[in-house]
Structures are given as C-alpha cells and as structure tokens.
Amino acid sequence: LSTCKTIDMELVKRKRIEAIRGQILSKLRLASPPSQGEVPPGPLPEAVLALYNSTRDRVAGESAEPEPEPEADYYAKEVTRVLMVETHNEIYDKFKQSTHSIYMFFNTSELREAVPEPVLLSRAELRLLRLKLKVEQHVELYQKYSNNSWRYLSNRLLAPSDSPEWLSFDVTGVVRQWLSRGGEIEGFRLSAHCSCDSRDNTLQVDINGFTTGRRGDLATIHGMNRPFLLLMATPLERAQHLQSSRHRRALDTNYCFSSTEKNCCVRQLYIDFRKDLGWKWIHEPKGYHANFCLGPCPYIWSLDTQYSKVLALYNQHNPGASAAPCCVPQALEPLPIVYYVGRKPKVEQLSNMIVRSCKCS
Amino acid sequence: LSTCKTIDMELVKRKRIEAIRGQILSKLRLASPPSQGEVPPGPLPEAVLALYNSTRDRVAGESAEPEPEPEADYYAKEVTRVLMVETHNEIYDKFKQSTHSIYMFFNTSELREAVPEPVLLSRAELRLLRLKLKVEQHVELYQKYSNNSWRYLSNRLLAPSDSPEWLSFDVTGVVRQWLSRGGEIEGFRLSAHCSCDSRDNTLQVDINGFTTGRRGDLATIHGMNRPFLLLMATPLERAQHLQSSRHRRALDTNYCFSSTEKNCCVRQLYIDFRKDLGWKWIHEPKGYHANFCLGPCPYIWSLDTQYSKVLALYNQHNPGASAAPCCVPQALEPLPIVYYVGRKPKVEQLSNMIVRSCKCS
C-alpha cells in the first residue's frame, strides 16, 4: 500500500505545524485568523483567566477517566460558568437545613443566557470546593425534581485530604433538562450517604460557600469559590454543523518521551503560536506541546514464521492485525485557549490537540 | 513520507487474514495451533456454552461504556464462573433476612481454584438475574467487610421491566482482595437505596435464586441462573508476560458499512476459521466479522488555502493534524472463543479483534 522513503524530520515537523494551523482554524470554524483591531489593551480580565484556569483544571483531571464523546466535540466548545444563587435568596428558606444535606440552587435564566438551546450543551459540571477533610465521607448528589422531591444522580467516596480540593460532578443531562423545561430556579442537594440500617450519618465534608447544617447557621462566602456550574457548549452560530457519530477521549500515557526508540513513538514538538504560526491572536496559552507520532510499524507475515519470537512482535508492531500498520496517536488531550472576537474575550477548548502517546494501528 | 500505489484489494484482504492468523495465536501465546487429537466427540458441554454465551452478552453491552484497559488485556483472558453458595449453607443464618436486603456468599477456595493469583484477575463481574419488575428500583451493592459490617460498592437504578434481565456489577477490586486475603466465605449484599430522610424502602426487585426476605421464606432455584461471579483472568502459564502500559477499549460505531465511500472507511471482511485459516480448533464461533480499514486520508496544506471549504475537510481527513494521516481502526471490539487444550474446553476472550469504525489519524 505504501513504500517508505528516508524520513526528512524537518519536513515532518513543518507538515505537522501547518496541519495544526488548519486544525485550529477548522475547529473554531474560522476561515482566517480573527482581526485584532478592537482588542482592548492590557492583561486579560481576571474573570476570563479564572475561567481559562477552570478549563485547564478540567483537562488535567480528564485523561484518567476516558468517556464517549459525540462527534460534535471535535469542534471547539465555548466555556461559561454560572454561580450558585446566593444563600440569602428565599429559595433556601423552603428547604430546612439538616445535618445530612446542603442545597445549591441555580437561576435557569442565567443558564439559558449561556446556552440558548439544550442541544448545544456538550458538558455541564457542578464544581464544589470541598474543604480539608479529616474522615472518609460517602456523599450523594440529588437533583430537585418536583416541588419537594429529589432524584438521585450520583455518589462519590471522598478520601481524607490535607487541603481544599475541587469536586466535579457531571450533570450534563440534568442541565439539558433544565434548559428545555426547567422552572425559574432549579437545584441540587449534596447529602451524606445513609444505608437502610445506619441512618445517623452526618455530612462531615464542608463545601466552600456554606457551613453545614449541623452548625445551624448558613454563611455564604461570596465570590468565585462558591459552587458553580461549568458549561461547555457549541456557540449558536456553529450549531448547524453538528453531526451525530462519535469520537473518543483517550488515555493519558507518556511512555515514549525521552526515548531513543527508532520504531513508532511519540516525538516532542512544542508549538509557539507567535514564532511557529505567526499568530498573535491566541492570548493564552503562548504555545503548547503538540507532539507527533513517527516511526515504522513493520508488517509481520505470520504464515511462514509461526514461532514464539515473531508472534511476540504482534503486540508491539501490529496489535490490531492491520494489513498496513501505521504509527498513529493513541492518547490525545484537549487544549483550552483564550482569544478575542472583536472586543470580546472567549475561552474555548479544542479537543484532541496534544498527542500523549502513539501506537501501531 | 509515503507514496501511494494502486490498491490491490485482494492483497490487502490476504494480508489482513494472515495478520489475524498471527494475532490470534499471539494473543493466546501459542506458537502453533493446538493439537485436536484428544478432543472428545460430540457437541460442546452445556456449561461451556453457557459460559461462552455469558461472555458474548458481556461483549454486547460493553462498547457503550469504554474504560481504560491495562496492556495485559491485549492477551486472551480465560473465563470462568463461580456460583453463589447455596442458600441452605449456614452462613446465611448469620445474616437476618430483612425487607431491604438480600445476601450472596461465595466460597473463596472456588475463586482461588479459578484464579490462583490476585494479579492474574483481569475482571470480575457479579451477575444477577433480576425477574420482571413493576416499579423503578434504586439498589446498592455492598461487600462483606468484617464480621458484621458492610462496605458500599456501587448502585444501579433499575427500570421497570416486563421480562427477566441479567444485571452485572464490576467487582474486580473486591474479588482481587478476597483472592489475596479473604476468609473462607465472602459475600455481597444487595439493598434498596435509602436516603437519610426516607428510610422505609423495600427491596422490590426479585433476584433469581431468592424470594426476598419480606416474604419470609428463602427459596433457592438451583442451577445456572442463581447469582454467580464471572471471572476473566490470565492463565498462570501466561502470567510472566504481563506488562503495565495501557491500551484502550474503544466506542462502538458502525457508520461506514454499506457505504460507497472511496476515502478512509471500514470495509467488511468475514473470516471463516475453517475456510480462510484452515483451522478446526476454534469450536465457537465458526467465524467472525473482522473487517478492516482502507481508503486515503489526504494531507491538506492549509497555508495556501485558508478558506472554509478546505478547512471543513480537516474533520474528515486529518482531525489529528497529522503530518501523514493514515486510515486506522477507531472502534474495536473483543471476540470470545471456545477451543480445546487436550481434553479440556476453554472459553477465552480476545481483545480488539473486530473493527467497528475507522478514522484518519
């Protein structure tokens, strides 16, 4: 199917860099880099940086738990966040504080402002800052369902911890529901896990923004660190291009770096947006480790050579039993970026941008 | 990097078939096909077929939930099952029947017979046949921890159903624990989910092998359909080859079949073990849809052609922005097989055998 030539490493790198130029623009559905004429001077607004950092946190924790992604996730997602309604809102008076639960409510008009159509929502995460925890705590998350009933969503076993830590719950389905038919204010309940024969559990974990009900008072810590919904959605103008087939988020492995391997391996490539692409329009990050895959994947003719030594090579060189094995990315990671459209800063996440490992396929 | 030649479809198929010959032997760590001299005549034993079908059921439900797989999962796994200790065993007398729980105990000596070393265990599933259910039921699974305490493992929301259905819980970690330091008899508890403020829940679901405690009596249905542990493990003789790097199980997509697409796509290829490989030693299945990937993935030079039409091609032809995009499998599925070693039938599962979709990478 193909014949090998001597590899020109510089040409490979140039082709990879040029492919990335097109890839980024393609993911953002931009025909050309956006004009920088209206960009306000000075550093990025703090809120934008906070949002960018939230997205980076999400990326860091992501590769450990691969999950299916719709094809639509090829395209960049606009990232927004909606803070929990402050605890002096009357909605909180309707739900008596207890030793085993705390309540978090959200204004659906704010959600709809961020995501006008339910179908545009790609992912929604409930983010909670848990304070230092001295005992293991099993918690459950519920969704406000009808007036006074709660629907179980998920659970988490929280390990003891020496410092505060962000918790993230995937609530995509719930938020999609709220966007399509939610009331004015919708909410979640975080509760201690109670089994049918031990019901005296107390919610030991403190969530920033509350002191738990067992203390009787409900103190709000204002600002960025109270519970919020992190939303990733396709912008409305990009919506008509959605497709329904599926991509996957891969595993994070770095087994190849700093190796002298001649066969298929991941190779280091740092792309500086300004130097390599001549771009000033991406404000954060300044560049990223794109990397690329390179090296031969020999085909093994098993017919004439069926003995252990040759068969052992299959796992390395042709695990998928391909007719023409090829060195391709195995694990990819997303890249969040900050750029301006006119005077407006945008935080978007580009999927499958960083090659973490390669495989013969 | 490579130059294209006219594609000889027959050569591609032959190379794929021969690669599969080596792949199967390699996954089983066999230097050559096993001798069939001692294979007993007649059909496969019913227990072996039941086990094979359990494995096939597992495969069918699998691609919907991809999860990380250790590199060791490249190699075939031996599949066994251990039935729940019958309910007339005295262990059941120690745990009072209640309206909210049922108990299932297992003999660890049987587990150790199936899997001599904890490290060999690749996956363990608790399989329960739930009878038809007229109400939605939220259940929780617990593990027997010390004499009379129970550790929460997982939960499931069971939808109402008009017919019996197998439930499967991943209990790999628990069984691995039992293999290394378990008592003589270990067990699980299936309970109704109770929240801290609604504690009167009854276990409404009937599990084959019991009538739940609320009926007072405890009837055992003997045979294959009482709760069991489905175990997948590396056979002892194959253990020294385990590695720790990671592979992934992909998503199930079938978007390419019966398409006239000339570019990269999944192509149909059925392999009949007897006709195509001259093999009589695989007793089940008789063959399988291996399929393969074929078709060009053009590289796009974005530098000179930054306009929407060309950029739109990135998603299809070079989503990973590769310097030399290649048509490779995206979604792969495992294949369970039945074969004999001497007089002994074996059920083993071969990972990543069936190509469900392709991608340019």
């Epitope: 304070l131 230092k132 925890l133 001295k134 005992v135 293991e136 003891p160 020496d162 410092s163 505060p164 107390t202 030991q204 974990v205 403190d206 920033n208 002191t211 738990t212 203390r215 103190a219 810590i221 | -």
Partner: antibody
C-alpha cells in the same frame, strides 16, 4: 491522653515518644503532635487522621514520623539535633462536633533534651 | 502557604476590661480557625473553633469572630484567671505549611 518517652539524648540518637490514650478509640479521632521550645510558642509537627493518613509541617522533611496502634500514637524523631529540645504535646481532635481539626484534649507534655 | 500572624505580641489589660486579639491569615481560610489559651507549665486549652463556636465548658466571655483572612478573639469582663498566652490555629490546609499556629499573644492583668 498521656505522653511518655521524653529524656536526655545525644544528637543523632533516634528517639520515639509515645502517646497513650484511654476512654476513646483512635479509629474515631485525629491526633496531633505539637512541640514548644522553652519560652517559645507552639510549633505544629504533624497529624494522623482516624483513617491513618499522616500529614506533616513543611519543615519536618522526614525528620519525624507519626504512626499509631489501637491505643497509642508514636512520634519517631529519626536524628535529633539540639534545636529539637522542647516539650512535646500529643492532642486529640474534637471529633464529629466539627468537620475541622481542632484539639480539645491535650496531654501534659513530655520533655526532650538534646545535648552532647 | 497559610501563615498565621497574631497581633499584638503582648497586651496588658485591667480586671473587668476587654481585650481584643487579632489573627491574620496570609490567604483566605474561610472560617476554619480555632483559639487556644495556654498558661505556664500547662498544655493549651481549646476555647473557640470554626471561628466562632464556643468549645464545651468555656465561658461566654470569650467570643470569636471573622472569616476569610481577618479573625478576632475578644475577652470581655477580664478576670485574673485569663492571664495566659493565646494562640490561633488554622485548619484550612496542611499543604506547604510551616506552622498551623500563630505566634501567640501574651495577656497580662494589671
């Protein structure tokens, strides 16, 4: 809660202090070690949670190790220096009355003198 | 790091008077703060935890307030028995922390 094991040691001689508890279970409470040099303030060394997790002050750097049995909490000083001369206190957390770790039951302390 | 700074280092107060001790955290610690009293030759005694909750058996003359980075311990109707050194303690994080306790404030009675 009572500390023991404090004595005069020469620099570099390993020393283990023991905190013996009664009337409560260590599987339900976090325990801490705090020291106080003569005429100085309280200096936190580290904590062991009910579940066994241990956390140390930044400066500890492997010089101290906290461990426990069912009724004792040990503090091992791997290689004492003269700067480790102090009264060493062991204290128990308030337990489930707060999700924070605060210490409401303290031992009387045990004096460690490091001198050549 | 979450460093705790106490002011003043020492204070003199008349019997029946009121004394205010401040504790400042280098970063926000929410309300994860406790106050202790220590008398010479004795171990510390817990007075207040979670910034404002009075510990069991402690006189209501002791009052804790504040959240975030600024905290205050107020002793009203001071008695001779209140002569001691007072320490604050943060419980927000142990990571990269040199000391969870403040430097102490010595209260002397005139």
């Amino acid at each position: 809660v009572e500390e023991s094991g404090g004595r005069l040691v020469t620099p570099g001689t390993p020393l283990t202090l023991t905190c013996t508890v009664s009337g409560f279970s260590l599987s339900n409470y976090a325990m801490t070690w705090v020291r106080q040099a003569p005429g100085k303030g309280l200096e936190w060394i580290g904590v062991i949670y009910a579940g066994g997790n241990t956390y140390y002050a930044n400066w500890v750097n492997g010089r101290f190790t906290i461990s426990k049995t069912s009724t004792t909490v040990d503090l091992k000083i791997t290689s004492p220096t003269t700067e480790d001369t102090a009264t060493y206190f062991c204290a128990r957390d308030v337990g489930s009355s707060s999700s924070g770790v605060y210490f409401n039951i303290w031992g009387p302390g045990t004096l460690v003198t490091v001198s050549s | 790091a979450y460093d705790m700074t106490q002011t003043p280092a020492s204070v003199e107060v008349a019997v029946g008077g009121t004394v205010t001790i401040k504790c400042q955290a280098s970063q926000s610690i929410g309300s994860r703060l406790a106050w202790y009293q220590q008398k010479p030759g004795q171990p510390p005694k817990l007075l207040i935890y979670d910034a404002s909750t009075l510990a069991s058996g402690v006189s209501s003359r002791f009052k804790g307030s504040g959240s975030g980075t600024e905290f205050t311990l107020t002793i009203s109707g001071v008695e001779c028995a209140d002569a001691a050194t007072y320490y604050c303690q943060q419980d927000y994080s142990y990571r990269h922390v040199d000391n969870i306790f403040g430097g102490g404030t010595k209260v002397e009675i005139k």
